[in-house]
Interface confidence: low
């Protein structure tokens, strides 16, 4: 960081005095200060000398020394006061331009720090400041009007008390410009419009801005419409409104309507589409498949999209069976409006129970009539398995019944030892039954199949297992014969364990 000599933050001298400011840095250094007369500059490598042998009030200001080569961008500063008894102010600029809500610095620098206690800011010709003018003073920089407003665009003077009288600076003109942040704000209502031929319609295009200088127009397809304009001013904004009233719409009124507004900052445009139809309509659709399969215990949301004009007069979800006569709970039915003419209706079916499989229908009604959309919900179940020992045509037979959905596949295993479930190491024999007999297969119900395994001799130290599986899961039943002999006996002499 460069160093200034003399090494004081402020220096107070009288007019006509000689002032020498020396700045030393590691590399080359540069001075920056208020534009004022009589300074001479002498640079010698890493030092730079700013000097005058005739200081005037105009030399009052902050002088900053920087080292351009310093990557940290360090600087040092000294403030010089040239206290002229006749001139308490050094005004650096006579016009200040800011945008609304910015701070406005009026650069009147005090030439004598002793005078700070008696300073004030006034409007020219001694007029007081406007109410709510919030300002602060710095002897080094001048008066700052905080968050300047357009109405504060005035001519100001800085006042100092010298020997009991007020001494004014030359005037400073403050220009506070309104911020036109962009093109006018626009609204076009409605965002979409549908009417039956012969009905009335209204389209309203409105634009607003902080500045009155803007244009707004409404166009149909590519034709600019001649519509009387209503103008208003409220909330500090200018508003212009165009209203298109159509008593009896016809097909030629349909199409794209654009509301366009422009000012010096740019142009805004927003569009809507107007549809004219011959008669009322009601369309139901779903992005989902109308045939749904869900695992028992899981949840499902059924969604129907409705496009309708005029609006719906009624709608509901109905369970059409085949199980209980329960109806969907209203709290599980939800309706959301995407826009004026499109709605989504959702039926939530959490933790589905066996009795909730079947047909669900969504019905809706408007002046165009009734429409319905029906979903078919089938529940998936993992297989349930049971095995019994019986005689069929005199032969000992193991009979396996498996029920689930989708239809289960059946595999028989014979393994050594007594076990609840055959593992690979114990397996002696495996039989796949590719075509088990279907005992029952009704819509929305489980499918029950039966597989037979004819066993001439039941081995007493072995286990027979029936396994069934489908896409949901698997189930099994192990049959353990308990017998003294090697031959088959009637079923009541055997035990089986599930």
């Amino acid at each position: 960081i460069p160093v200034i000599e003399p090494s004081v933050p402020e220096l107070v001298v009288k007019p006509g005095a000689t002032v020498t400011l020396r700045c030393v840095g590691n590399g080359s250094v540069e001075w920056d200060g208020p534009p004022s007369p009589h300074w001479t500059l002498y640079s010698d490598g890493s030092s730079s000398i700013l000097s005058t042998n005739n200081a005037t009030f105009q030399n009052t200001g902050t002088y900053r020394c920087t080292e351009p080569g310093d990557p940290l961008g360090g600087s040092a500063a000294i403030h010089l006061y040239v206290k002229d008894p006749a001139r308490p102010w050094n005004v650096l600029a006579q016009e200040v331009v800011v945008f609304e809500d910015q701070d406005a610095l009026l650069p009147c620098l005090l030439t004598d720090p002793v005078l700070e206690a008696g300073v004030s800011l006034v409007r020219v010709r001694g007029r007081p400041l406007m109410r709510h003018t919030n300002y602060s003073f710095s002897p080094w920089h001048g008066f700052t009007i905080h968050r300047a407003k357009f109405i504060q665009s005035q001519d100001y003077q800085c006042s100092a008390l010298m020997g009991g009288r007020k001494v004014m600076s030359i005037s400073i003109r403050l220009k506070v410009q309104k911020v036109i942040p962009g093109p006018p704000a626009l609204t076009l209502v409605p965002a979409e419009l549908v009417r039956i031929r012969g009905e009335a319609a209204q389209i309203v295009c409105s634009a607003s801005s902080v500045d009155v200088n803007f244009d707004v127009f409404l166009q149909h397809n590519n034709t600019k419409l001649a519509i009387p304009q209503q103008s208003d001013f409220h909330n500090n904004r200018y508003q212009k409104v165009l209203t298109l009233n159509l008593d009896q719409v016809d097909f030629q009124h349909a199409g794209n309507y654009s509301c366009v507004a422009s000012n010096v900052q740019g142009k805004h445009s927003t569009s809507m589409f107007f549809r004219v139809v011959e008669s009322a309509y009601l369309n139901l659709s779903s992005e989902q498949n109308l045939i749904q399969e869900v695992t028992v215990g899981e949840g499902l949301n059924l969604k129907v999209m409705v496009e309708a004009y005029p609006g719906l007069q009624g709608f509901n979800w109905t369970y059409l069976g085949p199980f209980s006569d329960h109806q969907p709970e209203p709290k599980l039915a939800n309706a959301t409006t995407k826009d004026t003419y499109r709605h989504t209706f959702t039926l939530s079916l959490p933790r589905l129970k066996p009795s909730e499989a079947g047909r669900y229908s969504f019905l809706a009604r408007n002046p165009g009539g009734w429409r319905a959309l029906t979903f078919e919900l089938t529940l998936r179940y993992p297989p349930e398995v049971s095995v019994i020992w019986t005689f069929i045509n005199g032969s000992g037979t193991l009979l396996c019944a498996a029920s689930g959905y989708p239809q289960p596949n059946v595999t028989w295993l014979q393994c050594s030892g007594h076990t609840d479930r055959c593992d690979e190491a114990q397996v002696l024999q495996v039989w796949d039954d590719p075509y088990p007999e279907v005992l029952s297969q009704e819509p929305f119900h489980k499918v029950t199949v039966q597989s037979l395994l004819t066993v001439e001799t039941l081995e007493h130290n072995q286990t027979y297992e029936c396994r069934a599986h489908n896409s949901v899961g698997s189930g099994s039943w192990a049959f353990i014969p308990i017998s003294a002999g090697a031959h088959t006996h009637p079923p009541d002499e055997f035990l089986f364990t599930p």
Epitope: V179, P181, Q265, K267, H268
Partner: antibody
Framework: QIQLVQSGAEVKKPGASVKVSCKAS????????MNWVRQAPGKSLEWIGD????????TYNQKFKGRVTLTVDTSTSTAYMELSSLRSEDTAVYYC????????????????WGQGTMVTVSS | DIQMTQSPSSLSASVGDRVTITCHAS??????LSWYQQKPGNAPKLLIY???NLHTGVPSRFSGSGSGTDFTLTISSLQPEDIATYYC?????????FGGGTKLEIK
């Protein structure tokens, strides 16, 4: 010099929300609309919406309406973009961009851009 | 929404070549079109605004032309540092939309 500095990369789970910040410096923050644009990996640029910092007025791309919220803090010259109900297809670099002003009466373009914030949505 | 279609989607040229990229708008956008250059891992940079105006600091080898629906970006003499993806963008109306991009490579 004029610059826009954005917050760091974010990793979010589907369904969560993300809030990206954009700090402006070197110009009058309230005098220019701030826009938000995103770019999915290997894809083109997609405009999300803009905000007028002076009034807080917003305009959103209909595609994002209901999920995106643009705000500003004029005291810190910072713009924010919050996107909710995130899904994997929201994985992208999100840019803030100042709308340019060349004294033209119409036509919009983006003359200053932030460095971008990578938002990854993954379960 | 106004659709912006750029062609070609990629292009290979030699240093010193004259390169032309076109952009077509689905409806009349007057002259409210801008062009951006984006290098990998960086934010886009404005090259041209209002169809033909060169943004501050952009080399004069870049130029833009067109109005209505058809626009062109031209690089009069391709330089190695011009390798990037170029995007057009319409500023006629909300929502602002961009072209799909043209990836420019050196032969």
């Amino acid at each position: 010099q004029i610059q826009l500095v954005q917050s760091g990369a974010e990793v979010k789970k589907p369904g969560a929300s993300v809030k990206v910040s954009c700090k402006a410096s070197g110009y009058s923050f309230t005098g220019y609309n701030m826009n938000w644009v995103r770019q999915a990996p290997g894809k083109s640029l997609e405009w999300i919406g803009d905000i007028n910092p002076y009034y807080g007025a917003t305009t959103y791309n209909q595609k994002f309406k209901g999920r995106v919220t643009l705000t500003v803090d004029t005291s810190t010259s910072t713009a924010y973009m919050e996107l909710s109900s995130l899904r994997s297809e929201d994985t992208a670099v999100y840019y803030c961009a100042r709308r340019g002003d060349y004294g033209d009466y119409e036509g919009w373009y983006f003359d200053v851009w932030g460095q971008g914030t990578m938002v990854t949505v993954s379960s | 929404d106004i659709q912006m279609t750029q062609s070609p989607s990629s292009l290979s040229a030699s240093v010193g070549d004259r390169v032309t990229i076109t952009c077509h708008a689905s409806q009349n956008i007057n002259v409210w079109l801008s062009w951006y250059q984006q290098k990998p891992g960086n934010a886009p940079k404005l090259l041209i605004y209002k169809a033909s105006n060169l943004h501050t600091g952009v080399p004069s080898r870049f130029s833009g032309s067109g109005s209505g629906t058809d626009f062109t970006l031209t690089i009069s003499s391709l330089q190695p540092e011009d390798i990037a993806t170029y995007y057009c963008q319409q500023g006629q109306s909300y929502p602002y939309t961009f072209g799909g991009g043209t990836k420019l490579e050196i032969k």
